[in-house]
């Protein structure tokens, strides 16, 4: 089953997706779609990048990270209950059947009555505790694992943002894998 991410109505939702560019600026086309990843494409596309830039996006969907370094995590602004569902992140690596496909489940909860402290960035769930198993057909698509291809600088940034938050323990306990390439 896919990894689940949560956000409250009115918040921004964050769906992580990363890859490691072969060289700085040597980007790979990426698409985000609403719905599970089909066999070749991305479902109902909400955002797309090419080898140079973001070339298609719809309102409320944007990339908050540095996509030129492979951080293609999706931010959905001001979510509503209708934003719940499966999202597809597809990294369209050139070559024969090289695509990386990740299905992520977004669960939107009604807003809490009592205000809660917010982070600099809206992290919508504890980091997942499972690793990626990569496949090619939809039937073989597994789950997005614990922040693949993240580097130490990103971890440091995340830790700073999470300090003094209830998510700090989740980060510590998540078993997040760090790969430096």
């Amino acid at each position: 089953s896919e990894v689940e991410y949560r956000a409250e109505v009115g918040q921004n939702a964050y769906l992580p997706c990363f890859y490691t560019p072969a060289a700085p600026g040597n980007l790979v086309p990426v698409c985000w779609g609403k719905g599970a990843c089909p066999v070749f494409e991305c479902g109902n596309v909400v955002l797309r990048t090419d080898e140079r830039d973001v070339n298609y996006w719809t309102s409320r969907y944007w990339l908050n990270g540095d996509f030129r370094k492979g951080d293609v995590s999706l931010t959905i602004e001001n979510v509503t209950l209708a934003d719940s569902g499966i999202y597809c992140c597809r990294i369209q690596i050139p070559g024969i059947m090289n695509d990386e496909k990740f299905n992520l489940k977004l669960v939107i909860k009604p807003a809490k009555v009592t205000p809660a402290p917010t982070l600099q960035r809206d992290f919508t769930a504890a980091f997942p505790r499972m690793l990626t198993t990569r496949g090619h057909g939809p039937a073989e698509t597994q789950t997005l694992g614990s922040l693949p291809d993240i580097n130490l600088t990103q971890i440091s940034t995340l830790a700073n943002e999470l300090r003094d938050s209830r998510l700090a323990n989740d980060l510590r306990d998540s078993g997040a894998t760090i790969r430096i390439g």
Epitope: V28, P29, V30, C31, G33, G35, A36, P38, V39, F40, E41, C42, G43, N44, V45, I86, R90, Q92, I93, P94, G95, I96, M97, N98, D99, N103, H136, G137, P138, A139, E140
Partner: antibody
């Protein structure tokens, strides 16, 4: 109106090569996965290659290593390069547009081009 | 690969009658609640034409007498009242995984 027009078919000897072209019009070509599907005389349909909108390539084992697919979005064209051809590759080759947002099934087809592999 | 078996190979039907075509997959083609099965019609000398996608969705421009049903591994194409232009070969196709595969076809002929 969506149109797909194949060309490049013909007679080729076993072991030879052929390059098929598919000229597309009437839609935003770069947004769609494209496939080639073939049909041997009197037989059923067989999918032989696909290229996604992002340029990823897909083949069945029967042609992997012998066929390659490419696209030129500037020319609204898709190509099938066939090498090391065998008698069993004889077929009508159709260019087909994958359904937008999916790509795994085909909502528009060309009329096909016949490839005959024979000595 | 997913093998699709169509039956019968040939179906003899009179105009106005109902035709029921079957397609069985060697494994499930269910994916997140959707059945990734399609049906095509092909007439002699012509390219195939998409009739049904995702098991039961009728493609735009296809007459309402065509319908699809099924889930998992068993799928059916029904033509409620055969017209003269419906006599053709019908293929099922799965888009669950690579390689994409087609069934062997069912020929619907005039009885």
């Amino acid at each position: 109106e969506v149109q797909l027009v194949e060309s490049g078919g013909g007679l080729v000897q076993p072991g030879g090569s052929l390059r098929l072209s598919c000229a597309a019009s009437g839609f935003t070509f770069s947004r769609y996965a494209m496939s080639w599907v073939r049909q041997a005389p009197g037989k059923g349909l067989e999918w032989v290659a696909a290229i996604s909108s992002g340029g990823s390539l897909y083949f069945p084992d029967s042609v992997k290593g012998r066929f390659t697919i490419s696209r030129d979005n500037a020319k609204n064209s898709c190509y099938l390069q066939m090498n090391s051809l065998r008698a069993e590759d004889t077929a009508v080759y159709y260019c087909a547009r994958g359904r937008e947002a999916d790509g795994g099934y085909f909502d528009y087809w060309g009329q096909g081009t016949l490839v005959t592999v024979s000595s | 690969e997913i093998v699709l078996t169509q039956s019968p190979a040939t179906l003899s039907v009179s105009p106005g009658e109902r035709a029921t075509l079957s397609c069985r997959a060697s494994e499930s083609v269910e994916y997140y609640g959707t059945s990734l099965m399609q049906w095509y019609q092909q007439k002699p000398g012509q390219a195939p034409r998409l009739l049904i996608y995702a098991a039961s969705n009728v493609e735009s421009g296809v007459p309402a007498r065509f319908s699809g049903s099924g889930s998992g591994t068993d799928f059916t194409l029904t033509i409620s009242s055969l017209q003269s232009e419906d006599f053709a070969v019908y293929y099922c196709q799965q888009s669950m995984k690579v390689p994409l595969t087609f069934g062997g076809g069912t020929k619907v002929e005039i009885k």
